[in-house]
């Protein structure tokens, strides 16, 4: 799978959306590696 | 609302080295990777590289590793791409663009900086 | 390097009509593409992510489809604001590419 940092970006703000943003304060795309996903 | 502002344009001599900045505003600057891309008159795009504000990370395109240094001044919100041993072929506009998720999903760009390298 | 290719480079088109710009990949890439649109002096401005997904507040007349090599942005009815040039980017692999962009003129 993608792990640049824009795949990862967007893979993140799906995550987002579909938890309704329901998420750790910390979730952010330069907080997380490519193993989150 | 979301504003990247980057610097004035510059004009350089042939073998000098140019620090161009992005100021971010409007969201968590160390969320987000920051871009830098170049467009040199009737070219196409051109990515030199991201930077992770959080960590100093960076990922560089191999045609410009060795000349160009992404770097960060967290406490300012604002990214600087330095572009070094400066050549004609680097005259081009150079923006930053960043996606950004929170408040508002969408890819930002700065408004350009215009280097001209001229002896 | 993965080289992406857009075609035409230019076209002529009138308002309302339909029009559809390709991209093709030198390798995979997924659906890890991106559609830009720029004006003469201006910053580009984001149209799609994800091959095919909407950023907010584009209009719904732009669409782009495509998975692996082959993408397109398609315009269902141009407008007189959409005159401009596109480009495709590809984010699956360092260096991130872009195409060498479709220039949309008015007929």
């Known amino acids: 799978s993608c792990n640049t940092a824009t795949c990862v970006t967007h893979r993140l703000a799906g995550l987002l959306s579909r938890s309704g943003g329901v998420v750790k304060d910390n979730f952010v795309p330069t907080n997380v590696g490519s193993e989150a996903f | 609302e979301v504003q990247l502002v980057q610097s004035g344009a510059e004009v350089k001599k042939p073998g000098a080295s140019v620090k161009v900045s992005c100021k971010a505003s409007?969201?968590?600057?160390?969320?987000?990777?920051m871009n830098w891309v170049r467009q040199a008159p009737g070219q196409r795009l051109e990515w030199i590289g991201d930077i992770n504000p959080n960590t100093g990370g960076t990922n560089y395109n191999q045609k410009f590793k060795g000349r160009a240094t992404l770097t960060v001044d967290k406490s300012a919100s604002t990214a600087y791409m330095e572009l070094s041993s400066l050549r004609s072929e680097d005259t081009a506009v150079y923006y930053c663009a960043s996606i950004i998720i929170v408040p508002n999903y969408f890819d930002y760009w700065g408004q350009g900086t215009t280097v001209t390298v001229s002896s | 390097d993965i080289q992406m290719t857009q075609s035409p480079s230019s076209l002529s088109a009138s308002v309302g009509d339909r029009v559809t710009i390709t991209c093709k990949a030198s390798?995979?890439?997924?659906?890890?593409v991106a559609w830009f649109q720029q004006k003469p002096g201006k910053s580009p401005k984001a149209l799609i992510y994800?091959?095919?997904y909407r950023y907010s507040g584009v209009p719904s007349r732009f669409s782009g489809s495509g998975s692996g090599t082959d993408f397109t942005l398609t315009i269902s009815s141009l407008q007189p604001e959409d005159f401009a040039t596109y480009y495709c980017q590809q984010y699956n692999n360092y260096p991130y590419t872009f195409g060498g962009g479709t220039k949309v003129e008015i007929k």
């Open positions: 390798q995979n890439v997924d659906t890890n």
């Open positions: 409007g969201y968590t600057f160390t969320d987000y990777y």
């Open positions: 994800s091959a095919s």
